[in-house]
């Protein structure tokens, strides 16, 4: 029951996490620029991985894709790649984990197969979460190290004076969504891996006994059920019967001096 709950919870947490990673990747507010008041209208600029947007105080918003930008930095391309890899791995992980769920019966799938699928999906969720966290962190690092502009640059260009408008870049909502979503996917993956351990068929801690009746006179050793099943005082797999009973891994072996103690 606990295994099913752990697996189910891991699946749900990962599902929420991956939905968050998708949302963060699509969001425009990865970085926001301080609001500046133009004499005409207050303007708020923000940008995502795919486009840049402008929102005016009137509520009007215009977004433009980066396809017209010349030479996007390699780091931005890397962030895009990390987020997409995270989404793809997460999506595959979700697909695998649906079939791995203990509460869902698909044909005559054995627990060992479900355990393997659960582990696979768990690892995929962990890698997916790490990709998202890495992508968001790389972007945040880019903002912190390269793009903080505390002073207004002013210079004279052809056709008049040119000066920068915004002062600095700040973290957008998408960064926080991405961090949280990546963390959730990671946690979900860990839970799936833990659930996998419970799903795997455990090795028996005693040897099976095969019985070979050697005629009518069978002398039983004292100990009853406990002795005959390998529990209780008979912990060293000693022979239970004087006649013909051997542990499975000794069935084909010849008697030795250690057979009867």
């Amino acid at each position: 029951m606990a295994v099913t709950a752990c697996q189910g919870l891991g699946f749900v947490v990962s599902l929420i996490g991956i939905a968050g990673i998708i949302a963060a990747t699509c969001m425009d507010q990865w970085s926001t620029q301080d609001l500046y008041n133009n004499p005409v209208t207050a303007v708020f600029n923000y940008q995502g991985l795919w486009r840049s947007c402008v929102r005016e105080s009137s509520g009007f918003t215009e977004c433009r894709g980066y396809f017209t930008l010349l030479g996007l930095p390699a780091m931005l391309q890397a962030v895009r790649a990390l987020m997409i890899v995270g989404i793809v791995l997460g999506a595959i992980g979700l697909l695998v984990s649906i079939f791995a769920l203990k509460c869902i019966r698909i044909g005559s799938m054995e627990d060992s197969a479900k355990a393997n699928m659960t582990l696979t999906s768990g690892i995929m969720f962990i890698v997916s979460g790490l990709c998202a966290i890495a992508g968001v962190s790389v972007f945040a690092n880019m903002l912190v190290t390269n793009f903080w502009m505390s002073t207004a640059n002013m210079y004279t260009g052809m056709g008049g004076m040119v000066q920068t408008v915004q002062t600095r870049y700040t973290f957008g909502a998408a960064l926080f969504v991405g961090w949280v979503a990546g963390g959730l996917t990671l946690i979900g993956g860990v839970m799936m891996c833990i659930a996998c351990r419970g799903l795997a068929p455990e090795e028996t801690n005693y040897k099976a006994v095969s019985y070979h009746a050697s005629g009518h006179s069978v002398a039983y050793k004292p100990g009853g059920f406990k002795a005959s099943t390998g529990f209780g005082s008979n912990t060293k797999n000693k022979k239970i019967y004087d006649g013909g009973a051997r542990t499975e891994d000794e069935v084909q072996s010849y008697p030795s001096k250690h057979d009867y103690v």
Partner: nanobody
Framework: EVQLVESGGGLVQPGGSLRLSCAAS????????MGWYRQAPGKQRELVAG???????RYADSVKGRFTISRDNAKNTLYLQMNSLRAEDTAVYYC?????????????????WGQGTLVTVSS
């Protein structure tokens, strides 16, 4: 290099009309707010009219009802239709734009000024 080039200025009689144009050229990613400013001899530069991408406009009290600002976002061009001109409208008219070039990421908006065009209202 991004630049704003004004045109349409000249000598006009009081009560007359003029249409100023401002064309933004260069590798422009997007333009936010565009506006017209003027500077009369011995005075400070003042906002005449401004227009945002969304069409929000603002006019100086002295030109309300006489001047009309408009822009063509596709052509990155700004216009100022000036009617019922007065002697006090004589000044150098400057085009102003908050724009982002295609060379920077994250997108940085720059405040760019034109070199100005002279409007003289005199009989």
């Amino acid at each position: 290099e991004v630049q704003l080039v004004e045109s349409g200025g000249g000598l006009v009689q009081p009560g007359g009309s003029l249409r100023l144009s401002c064309a933004a050229s260069g590798s422009i990613f997007s333009i936010n707010v565009m506006g017209w400013y003027r500077q009369a001899p011995g005075k400070q530069r003042e906002l005449v009219a401004g227009i945002s991408t969304g069409g929000t406009t603002r006019y100086a009290d002295s030109v309300k009802g006489r001047f009309t600002i408009s822009r063509d976002n596709a052509k990155n061009t700004l216009y100022l239709q000036m009617n019922s001109l007065r002697a006090e409208d004589t000044a150098v008219y400057y085009c102003n734009a908050d724009l982002a070039t295609s060379y920077s990421w994250p997108v940085r908006y720059l405040e760019v000024w034109g070199q100005g065009t002279l409007v003289t209202v005199s009989s």
